[in-house]
Amino acid sequence: LKGQEFAPSHQQVYAPLRADGDKPRAHLTVVRQTPTQHFKNQFPALHWEHELGLAFTKNRMNYTNKFLLIPESGDYFIYSQVTFRGMTSECSEIRQAGRPNKPDSITVVITKVTDSYPEPTQLLMGTKSVCEVGSNWFQPIYLGAMFSLQEGDKLMVNVSDISLVDYTKEDKTFFGAFLL
Amino acid sequence: LKGQEFAPSHQQVYAPLRADGDKPRAHLTVVRQTPTQHFKNQFPALHWEHELGLAFTKNRMNYTNKFLLIPESGDYFIYSQVTFRGMTSECSEIRQAGRPNKPDSITVVITKVTDSYPEPTQLLMGTKSVCEVGSNWFQPIYLGAMFSLQEGDKLMVNVSDISLVDYTKEDKTFFGAFLL
Amino acid sequence: LKGQEFAPSHQQVYAPLRADGDKPRAHLTVVRQTPTQHFKNQFPALHWEHELGLAFTKNRMNYTNKFLLIPESGDYFIYSQVTFRGMTSECSEIRQAGRPNKPDSITVVITKVTDSYPEPTQLLMGTKSVCEVGSNWFQPIYLGAMFSLQEGDKLMVNVSDISLVDYTKEDKTFFGAFLL
């Protein structure tokens, strides 16, 4: 209907339109993590606040047990930031000890679990070597992109090491998605 | 109106629809900063270019005095990147001097000021320790997420140290928001 | 049409509305790069996967020869992440040798080429000094913002050094755009 008046003519072909305000949307914020089981060879998943403070879910986008549940097929913009913090990384200690200098790393993965595929799909990954000189380091990894999702898909955020995640403030570590 | 033809039938229930092109939107770009007053215990706010080059505001989204003014309640995607640059951080100097090794840091905060809450609300924070070996360092911090805002809210970008912000290019340091 | 019922009255003024599902959209993912010519003083452009795995183009948004082609004028959100990886940066070697300590850097630029302007326009830049202690380093640069584009504009992603781009996984390095 580009560049064309949308008038109530019976000749008009009407595309399925919908109000923007009723689209599935969520912004989740960090909470203190409790150790949970996770599959071998899969990074642990974060769990999230979904209703207090800045966090919300709306229009049938629900959060349950670490997962955002996709209520409607379509193209979604998905984003997350995880702020990590730690003490001097082992890599500098290893280096001082004269052993092979393999850097430590921090990684965030936004993962999709879908009925139609047996393996979780990694949608987005941010990974960074950490080899800090300072005794205390902290830094964010931000990810965001658009994906075609199906009704019933589940999204989660996995991290390489839950103990390094900064859970102190809702503005530092977060996860969200919205239907375009 | 999901999955339903939008036809001019008087039986049709019509949601309040609106053309995407008339939604409030802004992309602001960096300018050279002049020192300004700021609240005690609050990082200084950046000011921005709003009409030259890549910068624009449209559909009642206005920029004035460091603030993006939200003209309509709804869910907005808000983003900013700030590129920082500096000389060798003090932390490495401290380290060489054998004093406690507290790293320097760079921080960006996207802040909301609202008349329904007396305290500014930090929506997004990106914070990173800086403990560089090189004598000149530079790096960006990127933030972006979705928030429910009210008509009359004001958004600003605060940084830990205005003197470290790279104001040389409009593509390096920017701030934007759009109604979803 | 804010806050107003959108009903099929012949008195109603209809804004040009369009279904969200028919808007131009693309998400491109990394492929192994083949060396290509590029203009002197301009960083080389990455080429991309546009249909396999997570990659797609839709609704007249086409990809050809490193470029996303904009099929319709409007405001687009454009994003990219490039993950870089390398061996110990020269800057630390230079430092050990006692020579001037100029850091290496990694840079990503999202560039617009338009008929109406002879020079490519840099829309977004993420640039970071790299002066790593570890022997192997890796890190992402993420960019995203909204721009007003014209039908016929072309978008590309340029990087400072193609040989440092991690092309191993579609979730690590990507490029996308969608009409708002």
Epitope: - | T36, F39, F67, V113, Y117 | -
Partner: antibody, heavy 116, light 106 residues
Framework: QVQLQESGPGLVRPSQTLSLTCTVS????????MHWVRQRPGRGLEWMGR????????KYNPSLKSRVTITRDTSKNQVSLRLSSVTAADTAVYYC?????????WGQGSLVTVSS | DIQMTQSPSSLSASVGDRVTITCRAS?????MYWYQQKPGKAPKLLIY???NLASGVPSRFSGSGSGTDFTFTISSLQPEDIATYYC?????????FGQGTKVEIK
Amino acid sequence: QVQLQESGPGLVRPSQTLSLTCTVSGFDMQDTYMHWVRQRPGRGLEWMGRIDPAGGHTKYNPSLKSRVTITRDTSKNQVSLRLSSVTAADTAVYYCVRSGGLPDEWGQGSLVTVSS
Amino acid sequence: DIQMTQSPSSLSASVGDRVTITCRASQGVEYMYWYQQKPGKAPKLLIYGASNLASGVPSRFSGSGSGTDFTFTISSLQPEDIATYYCQQWEGNPRTFGQGTKVEIK
């Protein structure tokens, strides 16, 4: 330090327009919102409206909307209140209030009596 | 309008007593504010966002609650606490205050 100072005539005739000015110092008014609140003798507090000095956007108490106007002059660091068609029921202490940046700050108040 | 019903309208307590004032909103609000007003003075913010203590306010003052029911407490009444206390909601238009609770010493 932060200061808000209300000023204006202490006596206004019925049916006339009440005009008050709030002059602020110690902060950038545009970083906040400025409100007017009144307190009638022996009564509670009544919010009248507010202005965003950055953009000039106003919100008013619907019960007063037809009579109240709030404006700002950022160059003078002032916010003004005008209340038209006053009656004896508008006799009150009028406070200028800052919000949006802690601490919430109030002026000391200005007593306006409506009497002929 | 969102009506704020504050109770009691007045109370008399001894120094050291725990004093509780309640405020009920006619519809749910996210944030509640509590002010103290001494005779001849402007109100002073004590509690914001239902439970946050404003800067410089003694820790004997506290607030709690959510939705429609909110409580303001003075854990140990002091002579300088003699004042009228108001609740206020900032969300609906207009902003509305409770009618006030006058606190006196026995």
